[in-house]
Amino acid sequence: KELKVTQPEKSVSVAAGDSTVLNCTLTSLLPVGPIRWYRGVGPSRLLIYSFAGEYVPRIRNVSDTTKRNNMDFSIRISNVTPADAGIYYCVKFQKGSSEPDTEIQSGGGTEVYVLAK
């Protein structure tokens, strides 16, 4: 099946201190390789979360990503602050061994607006 990364929401609004879910689904897990969430684009983009076993405070996967056929890589960000505002991209990589992982497809992005309480 052809790989497609889908972020259904173009934007979400969340009040400071609340939590929000950023949705991302894949149509295929192949080629094997990690899925990562970034804020922003280009060389200065910020890695927010990687589905490769690392612990990140305030961020959790929504579904059980240990299922071998899981294609839901949505995340929940808790206790949102104004600094969390920006456009978030769900990105699928093909594994690299001697070389770095190769980005093969990105979702369309979801803009997070943080509203004052």
């Epitope: 094997v32 076993g53 059980d64 240990t66 071998r68 001697s98």
Partner: antibody, heavy 118, light 107 residues
Framework: DLQLVESGGGVVRPGESLRLSCAAS????????MSWVRQAPGKGLEWLAG????????YYIDSVKGRFTISRDNSKNSLYLQMNSLTAEDTAVYYC???????????WGLGTLVTVSS | ALTQPASVSANPGETVKIICSGG??????YGWYQQKSPGSAPVTVI????KRPSDIPSRFSGSASGSAATLTITGVRVEDEAVYFC???????????FGAGTTLTVL
């Protein structure tokens, strides 16, 4: 310290059943998929079954499908393998192993020996 | 099926390479597992093709390309004598497999 301790092995007759347990400690058990791997005497490693962190999804090698059942109780930090209709070919050391994010293994238990003999 | 040599030997200080073939780079991740005696607990020396657990010495490294994975031990020691199993996870079939094992003898 991370530990995986198997128990429940022993000597059984062909056709009988056995339930293996694996007690986990030193990590958040409910966050990890787990697997059972066995090693017959003088042979290599053979993956048998895996289970997702939440326990809803299970996976088996064809040769044990329908005879073996993997399960877990996250409230008890325990993994199980129910083995039915055992044959001499099931004689082996059985290991539980913690899975990495991409379903390889990073930690292994010490193993428990199962002997099927008449 | 994963294929690896039945045995390799080396003198202390030499570099040893064990090659495991038979996987598909597109759908497969590889790991390497050390077993010092039959029936003893395996120890993971490499997972995810090239990731070394924190308690494994840096002389162990892994790589993968094409349909093969390689375990390299740089400056092999007597205590590295063991059977090394390559393992693979296939994302196409959701199944794990192992090679038959390679006995490393340090002369």
């Amino acid at each position: 310290d991370l530990q995986l301790v198997e128990s429940g092995g022993g000597v059984v007759r062909p056709g009988e059943s056995l339930r293996l347990s694996c007690a986990a400690s030193g990590f958040t058990f409910s966050s990890y998929a787990m697997s059972w791997v066995r090693q017959a005497p003088g042979k290599g490693l053979e993956w048998l079954a895996g289970i997702s962190a939440g326990g809803s999804d299970t996976y088996y090698i064809d040769s044990v499908k329908g005879r073996f059942t993997i399960s877990r109780d996250n409230s008890k930090n325990s993994l199980y393998l129910q083995m039915n209709s055992l044959t001499a070919e099931d004689t082996a050391v059985y290991y539980c192993a913690r899975e990495t994010w991409n379903h390889l293994f990073d930690y292994w238990g010490l193993g428990t020996l199962v002997t099927v003999s008449s | 099926a994963l294929t690896q040599p039945a045995s390799v030997s080396a003198n202390p200080g030499e570099t040893v390479k064990i090659i495991c073939s038979g996987g598909d780079y597109y759908s497969t991740y590889y790991g390497w597992y050390q077993q010092k005696s039959p029936g003893s607990a395996p120890v993971t020396v490499i997972h995810s093709d090239d990731k070394r657990p924190s308690d494994i010495p840096s002389r162990f490294s892994g790589s993968a390309s094409g349909s093969a994975a390689t375990l390299t031990i740089t400056g092999v020691r007597v205590e590295d004598e063991a059977v090394y199993f390559c393992g693979a996870y296939d994302g196409r079939t959701y199944i794990n497999t192992f090679g038959a094992g390679t006995t490393l003898t340090v002369l």
